[in-house]
Interface confidence: low
């Protein structure tokens, strides 16, 4: 960032998207601003228009190519600038030399589905989306289950320390509605963070059979 009142944060989804958020106290109103990406060893450059997400923050997505194309590698450095128009000029408001594989945030897992459900157990699977083949199996997951009468924030986190795209939830209550979410994080990258949570998957455990406890 340029100064103490400006923050410029970007993440690479490991394939073809860099998402950026720029926030600045007292930022110029009604001014056109954009993020400009300038790689050090590639022939392309890319811009996106910053759009307001709150009173003092703006966001945009740099689309570098087809969703599953590998546009950057571990050795790339991309200079990212926030440029705002001042008359006929573009003024640099913030800048960073961005190392994509040090600043990873993957897309949320997709295709959540119930593989098998019983009275006390439920087996759920999912897929990762637009994740680089560079990671091989070096991914971890967090999952959480929403129980009736509780909030997501109260749900205990279940950690899967390997690339395991399924989970077997146990000690569930029969005939009860639950929701389930999962998120993913590569092991690589100093500033890497968790993906957004997946869309919640709703499921219901089977009712207990009359006269016996399963």
């Amino acid at each position: 960032a340029v100064n103490g009142t400006s923050q410029f944060t970007c993440f690479y989804n490991s394939r073809a998207n860099i998402s950026c958020v720029w926030s600045q106290d007292g930022a110029l109103q009604d001014t056109s601003c954009q993020v400009h990406a300038w790689p050090d060893r590639r022939r392309w450059n890319q811009t996106c228009e910053l759009l307001p997400v709150s009173q003092a923050s703006w966001a945009c997505n740099l689309i570098l190519g087809a969703p599953d194309s590998q546009k950057l590698t571990t050795v790339d450095i991309v200079t990212l600038r926030v440029l705002c128009r001042e008359g006929v000029r573009w003024r640099v408001m913030a800048i960073q030399d961005f190392k994509p594989f040090e600043n990873l945030r993957l897309m949320a897992p997709i295709s959540l589905q119930v593989v098998h459900v019983e009275t006390h157990r439920c087996n759920i699977s999912w897929e990762i989306s637009q994740a680089s083949h560079y990671f091989e199996r070096h991914l971890e997951f967090e999952a959480r289950t929403l129980s009736p009468g509780h909030t997501w924030e109260e749900a205990p986190l279940l950690t899967l320390k390997q690339k395991q795209e399924w989970i077997c939830l146990e000690t569930l209550t029969p005939d009860t509605q639950y929701e389930f979410q999962v998120r993913v994080k590569p092991l690589q990258g100093e500033f890497t963070t968790w993906s957004p949570w997946s869309q919640p998957l709703a499921f219901r455990t089977k009712p207990a059979a009359l006269g016996k406890d399963t």
């Epitope: 340029v2 100064n3 450095i77 200079t79 000029r89 573009w90 640099v92 960073q96 030399d97």
Partner: nanobody
Framework: QVQLVESGGGLVQAGGSLGLACALS????????MAWFRQAPGKEREFVAS????????DYVASVQGRFTVSRDNNKNTVYLQMNSLKPEDTAVYYC????????????????WGQGTQVTVSS
């Protein structure tokens, strides 16, 4: 008000070395692409070298490529020009320039300028 102050000029023999520095005050240094220009007696001011705001990318006029090195220290608000293997034809007043529009740094009319420092290369 942005101010640029150059230092480090002087008299040097052909084949020698000299370093110039330029300090920016009055604004946030990292917002500026910085450049060095020079103007020999009776000639137009010409672009010598530039360094982008991050310091990652540099650009040189062909006649100084491999002899001059431009760099910057964003913590010290200063841009440098290290000149080696100097030639008599490098004799000129050297000017520091700053521009917040990094596409326009070679433009003579849109830059903020320092007062210049004399470099004389004797044979």
């Amino acid at each position: 008000q942005v101010q640029l102050v150059e230092s480090g000029g002087g008299l040097v023999q052909a084949g020698g070395s000299l370093g110039l520095a330029c300090a920016l005050s009055g604004d946030v240094f990292v917002r500026y692409t910085m450049a060095w220009f020079r103007q020999a007696p009776g000639k137009e001011r010409e672009f010598v070298a530039s360094v982008t705001d991050s310091g990652r990318t540099t650009d040189y006029v062909a006649s100084v490529q491999g002899r001059f090195t431009v760099s910057r220290d964003n913590n010290k608000n200063t841009v440098y020009l290290q000149m080696n293997s100097l030639k008599p034809e490098d004799t000129a007043v050297y000017y520091c320039a700053a521009n917040t529009d990094y596409f326009q740094i070679r433009s003579l009319d849109r830059n903020t300028w320092g007062q210049g420092t004399q470099v004389t290369v004797s044979s």
